[in-house]
């Protein structure tokens, strides 16, 4: 079964996927596609990297992390209900049938209509329903709470800060990370 991630309409969704390059700059081709991972590559490719760079992308889909260090997590900008579904992250490790593939399920919820809260910089308050499990199993659900009073730039900043915080560590420990070499 796919690991499930959640976001609300209008937010940016974050789908984690990591690998550890065998050596700095020794990159592995990666593709992201809408739909479960097929037999080869990705179906409905939305973003692709090669051994050097991102070589294909479509609007609203980007890598916010440092893909040169193996953070190939996908950000989907300003999601709509149509963005719901399964996404494939495929890490095309060189060799004979070495691919690693991850199916991640994105659930988009309608935006909540709530009174504008007091601005919060505290991560727990800003992201009230973000759940991650530590240690053993995968992060079953990642939910970005509604942020009616924070603009996209602030969301992006928070996401960047989060990525450098405990969440990134939890996700890297969640089984969606592979080590090469």
């Amino acid at each position: 079964s796919e690991v499930e991630y959640r976001a609300e309409v209008g937010q940016n969704a974050y789908l984690p996927c990591f690998y550890t390059p065998a050596a700095p700059g020794n990159l592995v081709p990666v593709c992201w596609g809408k739909g479960a991972c097929p037999v080869f590559e990705c179906g409905n490719v939305v973003l692709r990297t090669d051994e050097r760079d991102v070589n294909y992308w479509t609007s609203r889909y980007w890598l916010n992390g440092d893909f040169r260090k193996g953070d190939v997590s996908l950000t989907i900008e300003n999601v709509t209900l149509a963005d719901s579904g399964i996404y494939c992250c495929r890490i095309q490790i060189p060799g004979i049938m070495n691919d690693e593939k991850f199916n991640l399920k994105l659930v988009i919820k309608p935006a909540k209509v709530t009174p504008a809260p007091t601005r919060q910089r505290d991560f727990t308050a800003a992201f009230p329903r973000m759940l991650t499990t530590r240690g053993h199993g995968p992060a079953e659900t990642q939910t970005l709470g509604s942020l009616p009073d924070i603009n996209l730039t602030q969301i992006s900043t928070l996401a960047n800060e989060l990525r450098d915080s405990r969440l990134a560590n939890d996700l890297r420990d969640s089984g969606a990370t592979i080590r090469i070499g």
């Epitope: 081709p29 479960a36 037999v39 080869f40 179906g43």
Partner: antibody
């Protein structure tokens, strides 16, 4: 014109070797996964092998693993299949095929490989 | 390996008839199902990809449907050039596998 053209087939004895080639034209060869699919006389289609666009990742059917090697030369727009330790059951028409949108969307005309003593 | 079972193995029909060929996968393959047409002595030709998407240049009388394990190829009004063998193929799980084929003959 977008096309694939196989060559290299022929008659070979059991245990022998053969190298098939597939020349691609009319598209950006290095951007596509490529495959070999075979068809024994009067039989159905059987996937044999595939290779990623860069050539770094390769895939084989169990029936040929360890005997066949797929490779490509993107500078020459050419796909190869090196076939060693050939058996009678490898007798077939071998097609090269482009893989796109999760399907084999472009096929060559095929080259016949006959393994017989 | 996923087993693809086509039915019927052969059928006879007349020009202008509508025909349906079915393909069943031994396990869920989402919509990763393709249909090919092959004429004697020729290479296969892609007709339908992703269960229902018509390949460029293929006449609209060909259509595909289904998801999960059960799929169909429909030819709405047979033309003389449609008499051939048809194969389904799954692209969900390794290795890719084909059905055994359905031979469509003129009645």
């Amino acid at each position: 014109e977008v096309q694939l053209l196989e060559s290299g087939g022929g008659l070979v004895q059991p245990g022998g070797s053969l190298r098939l080639s597939c020349a691609a034209s009319g598209f950006t060869f290095s951007s596509y996964y490529m495959s070999w699919v075979r068809q024994a006389p009067g039989k159905g289609l059987e996937w044999v092998s595939a290779i990623s666009g860069s050539g770094g990742s390769t895939y084989y059917a169990d029936s040929v693993k360890g005997r066949f090697t797929i490779s490509r030369d993107n500078s020459k727009n050419t796909l190869y299949l090196q076939m060693n330790s050939l058996r009678a059951e490898d007798t077939a028409v071998y097609y090269c095929a482009r893989y796109a949108r999760t399907a084999f969307d472009l096929w060559g005309q095929g080259t016949l490989v006959t393994v017989s003593s | 390996d996923i087993v693809m079972t086509q039915s019927p193995s052969s059928l006879s029909a007349s020009v202008g008839d509508g025909v349906t060929i079915t393909c069943q996968a031994s396990q869920d393959i989402y919509n990763y199902l393709n249909w090919y047409q092959q004429k004697p002595g020729k290479a296969p030709k892609l007709l339908i990809y992703a269960a229902s998407s018509l390949q460029s240049g293929v006449p609209s009388r060909f259509s595909g449907s289904g998801s999960g394990t059960d799929f169909t190829l429909t030819i709405s009004s047979l033309q003389p050039e449609d008499f051939a063998t048809y194969y389904c193929q799954q692209a969900n799980s390794f290795p890719p596998t084909f059905g055994q084929g359905t031979k469509l003959e003129i009645k």
